[in-house]
Interface confidence: low
């Protein structure tokens, strides 16, 4: 590094590549003024600093336009790799998500991480939970010891990408029925249900038998 400086001091510093685009250049410090539209950037070599005039600023710096001269200024945003301005990041360090010009290790509420771009995008926005519904089972509010009560919430805004899942919009929990027995002395309709199911099954079996017989005779006639 030191040799480079010794060489450039012997040579005419104007021909030094560091002086490209300069309005003012010195052998010790390189550029100190840049041509219009170029950005002044202070580069380090060891503990020496020297100026360069660049068309665009290096990673970790942004182009700051000023009346006296445009310059490259350091991104001061935490965990930011490159930025557009003093307070707007465009690329975060590895492991951080970009959201509105800032870098986060976790996306804020209402936003979901998009792993392929490491950005926080608008997640699925849901409303508030409703009150818990009536405790019921098989659409009945009596006749059982335990039932289920449900609450729901609406999707207010769909996510920008289909790959982003919405949180659950309905949830149920076990609840104790207020009436173990239904009014009017009716027993639990379990036995009746069982009888009906048995009847139904027998009817289906009989119909299937008849259908098989019909197919067999039909084939014989052909």
């Amino acid at each position: 590094q030191g040799n480079r400086w010794r060489r450039s001091k012997r040579a005419s510093y104007v021909s030094n590549p560091i002086c490209k685009g300069c309005l003012s250049c010195s052998k010790d410090n390189g550029c100190s003024r840049c041509q219009q539209k170029l950005f002044f950037f202070l580069r380090r070599e060891g503990m020496r600093q020297y100026g360069e005039c660049l068309h665009s600023c290096p990673s970790g710096y942004y182009g700051h336009r000023a009346p006296d001269m445009n310059r490259c200024a350091r991104c001061r945003i935490e965990n930011c790799d490159s930025c557009f301005s003093k307070d707007f990041c465009t690329k975060c360090k590895v492991g951080f998500y970009l959201h509105r010009g800032r870098c986060f290790d976790e996306c804020p509420d209402g936003f979901a991480p998009l792993e392929e771009t490491m950005e926080c995008v608008e997640g699925c926005e849901v409303g508030h939970w409703s009150e818990w519904g009536t405790c019921s089972r098989n659409n009945r509010t009596c006749g059982f010891k335990w039932g289920l009560e449900t609450r729901t919430r609406q999707i207010v805004k769909k996510p920008v990408k289909d790959t982003i899942l919405c949180p659950t919009i309905a949830e149920s929990r076990r609840c104790k029925m207020t009436m173990r027995h239904c009014p009017g002395g009716k027993r639990t309709p379990k036995a009746k249900e069982k009888r009906n199911k048995k009847k139904k099954r027998k009817l289906i079996e009989r119909a299937q038998e008849q259908h098989s017989v019909f197919l067999a005779t039909d084939r014989a006639n052909q």
């Epitope: 410090n29 100190s32 003024r33 202070l42 380090r44 060891g46 600093q49 100026g51 006296d68 001061r76």
Partner: antibody, heavy 119, light 110 residues
């Protein structure tokens, strides 16, 4: 908001040792060069030591008056920079400031910690 | 000859303008320099970096402050002086392996 908080100052006898600490917040500490600058009572500013980042292998530089006695180090995982001061002299009595270094100048300063070397 | 030379004190009136000077030794005459401001019992504050004919200000440095240079001289100009401008102003420069400060100029408002 960039914040630098120094600690570890105090009264020490000549030829004694002291370790100053500086905790940084509000910026990506591992990206920044760090320095210690001191100011003797009623005097001007004096640069003391400087440490580069990991990219530059944590290279260190010292002013002639402290070389061989002081040692600067950093712990990026804890956002800390340290100044180990050995074989202290009365002329080391000063307020020691921890500073961030933008492009080899000191753009942010801590509140300082007082070091008094006296028998 | 010191690397950076500053006059010990300067006085000026409230609302007026003032120009502080930092003179570089011949071997450093092309260097950039920095200006720092320090109020009594406070930490120094970076104001700006001055190059040949241009400057880069630090965050929070008022527009009333500007920097310029002429040969080996570097200037800090303050217009419309305010009470809070009363402070010591240091210039500083980086060399190959060290950083040097000037002795400071005390700005007093009349």
């Amino acid at each position: 908001e960039v914040q630098l908080v120094e600690s570890g100052g105090g009264l020490v006898k000549p030829e004694g040792s002291l370790k100053l600490s500086c905790v940084a917040s509000g910026f990506t500490f591992s990206d920044y060069f760090m320095s210690w600058v001191r100011q003797a009572p009623g005097q001007g500013l004096e640069w003391v030591a400087h440490i580069y980042t990991k990219t530059y292998n944590y290279a260190t530089y010292y002013s002639g008056s402290v070389k061989g006695r002081f040692s600067i180090s950093r712990d990026d995982s804890r956002n800390m920079v340290y100044l180990q001061m050995n074989n202290l002299r009365t002329e080391d009595t000063a307020t020691y400031y921890c500073t961030t270094d933008e492009d080899w100048y000191f753009d942010f300063w801590g509140q300082g910690t007082q070091v008094t070397v006296s028998s | 000859q010191p690397v950076l030379t500053q006059s010990p004190s300067v006085s000026a009136s409230l609302g007026a303008s003032v120009k502080l000077t930092c003179t570089l030794s011949s071997q450093h005459s092309t260097n950039y320099i920095e200006w720092y401001q320090q109020h009594p019992d406070k930490s120094p504050k970076f104001l700006m970096q001055v190059r040949d004919g241009s400057h880069s200000k630090g965050d929070g440095t008022p527009d009333r402050f500007s920097g310029s240079s002429s040969g080996a001289h570097r200037y800090l100009s303050i217009s419309n002086l305010q009470l809070e401008d009363e402070a010591i102003y240091y210039c500083g420069l980086s060399d190959v392996s060290l950083y040097l400060f000037g002795s400071g100029t005390q700005l007093t408002l009349l």
